[in-house]
């Protein structure tokens, strides 16, 4: 799986979308999990409604919400009041039994609020020191960069 990068601004909301084949994943619940390192385990954050037919209903765990358009084939995760500690590697998953298929690997980047003047010298303009291989960037304002046009380095 390639990694899709979603960049949001600290304190604002970030919407992550995970498209999938609605026929292939018919009847399956979905989940959003946080991965502990690129090769580490993925810890469940929130999952869609226990009844698949009610997957369109928003479910929430803390500041993270999930909803599934099962007909259109789009899982949407919303991270409210984005904080630096929300940054990291995540997965959208399709559940079947005790197994989980990865729909999309996601890297969430939290950008400093440009309107926060606590220390203008610390404002982060994503650099070009090293691209995140095979990544695709989506900003919280829904502007997608072209493949390979990654404006920031990978993280640890």
């Amino acid at each position: 799986h390639n990694t899709t990068v979603f960049q949001g601004v600290e304190g604002q909301s970030l919407q992550v979308s995970c498209p999938y084949d609605s026929m292939k994943h018919w009847g399956r619940r979905k989940a959003w999990c946080r991965q502990l390192g690129e090769k580490g385990p993925c810890q469940r954050v929130v999952s869609t409604h226990n009844l698949w037919l009610l997957s369109f209903l928003r479910r929430r765990n803390g500041s993270t919400a999930i909803t599934d358009d099962t007909l259109g084939g789009t899982l949407t995760i919303t991270l409210r009041n984005l904080q630096p500690h929300d940054a990291g590697f995540y997965q959208c998953q399709s559940l079947h039994g005790s197994e989980a298929d990865t729909l999309r690997k996601v890297l969430v980047e939290v950008l400093a609020d440009p309107l926060d003047h606590r220390d203008a010298g610390d404002l982060w303009v994503p650099g070009e020191s090293e691209s995140f291989e095979d990544a695709h960037v989506e900003h919280s304002i829904s502007r997608s960069l072209l493949e390979g046009e990654i404006p920031f380095p990978p993280t640890s």
Partner: antibody, heavy 120, light 107 residues
Framework: QVQLVQSGAEVKKPGASVKVSCKAS????????IHWVRQAPGQGLEWMGW????????KYAPKFQGRVTITADTSTSTAYMELSSLRSEDTAVYYC?????????????WGQGTLVTVSS | DIQMTQSPSSLSASVGDRVTITCHAS??????LSWYQQKPGKAPKLLIY???NLHTGVPSRFSGSGSGTDFTLTISSLQPEDFATYYC?????????FGQGTKVEIK
């Protein structure tokens, strides 16, 4: 028991090469990234590079590029670090270090260190 | 490369003291910072990952904070076994880089 066991101390002459091994037990190295970090006597820690044993991809610090080669043999769960064109300032303890990579790895294992002395 | 600057480079403290070590990154590194403890002749030991997360088995007197460029490691009540050298390491980009270390000595 999860551990990384490194090869023994080495004494080398300037211009020679050294190859240090790091054998993992209690876990599969394919599930981790293996890093190499060195520490000169009385000095701080210096990251040299890493390998993803799963696919053999490696990445090196610019300072060591062209002089260091990191490899891994998944059949023996062993990683190797070879440093060539040795000079006296390469005298250091070399550590291998396993983690799950970026984005908040909670796994962190270190070898016991291998002292490499470069002296004529 | 991202430069990591620790301060102080050394400090003397007594058992029971509250100790604070800071680490400054030359570029924004979000929360991708780890803190290590190293004792003479031993390998480093991970204390804190992702700026503020306590590694398994690490006593709760250790805590980390910060994001962006400025980070802090705090030992709330120094114990005899805490006398060691502490390093910060950034993982925002490769090459990973360490701070120069802070040696905590007995006063």
């Amino acid at each position: 028991q999860v551990q990384l066991v490194q090869s023994g101390a080495e004494v080398k002459k300037p211009g020679a090469s050294v190859k240090v091994s790091c054998k993992a037990s209690g876990f599969s190295i394919e599930d981790f990234y293996i890093h190499w970090v060195r520490q000169a006597p009385g000095q701080g820690l210096e990251w040299m590079g890493w390998i993803d044993p799963e696919n053999g991809e490696s990445k090196y610090a610019p300072k060591f590029q062209g002089r260091v080669t990191i490899t891994a043999d998944t059949s023996t769960s062993t990683a190797y670090m070879e440093l060539s064109s040795l000079r006296s300032e390469d005298t250091a303890v070399y550590y291998c270090h396993a983690d799950h990579g970026n984005y908040g790895s909670t796994m962190d294992y270190w070898g016991q260190g291998t002292l490499v002395t470069v002296s004529s | 490369d991202i430069q990591m600057t620790q301060s102080p480079s050394s400090l003397s403290a007594s058992v029971g003291d509250r100790v604070t070590i800071t680490c400054h990154a030359s570029q924004h590194i979000n929360v991708w910072l780890s803190w290590y403890q190293q004792k003479p002749g031993k390998a480093p030991k991970l204390l804190i990952y992702k700026a503020s997360n306590l590694h398994t088995g690490v006593p709760s007197r250790f805590s980390g904070s910060g994001s962006g460029t400025d980070f802090t490691l705090t030992i709330s009540s120094l114990q005899p076994e805490d006398f060691a050298t502490y390093y910060c390491q950034q993982g925002q980009t490769y090459p990973r880089t360490f701070g120069q270390g802070t040696k905590v000595e007995i006063k």
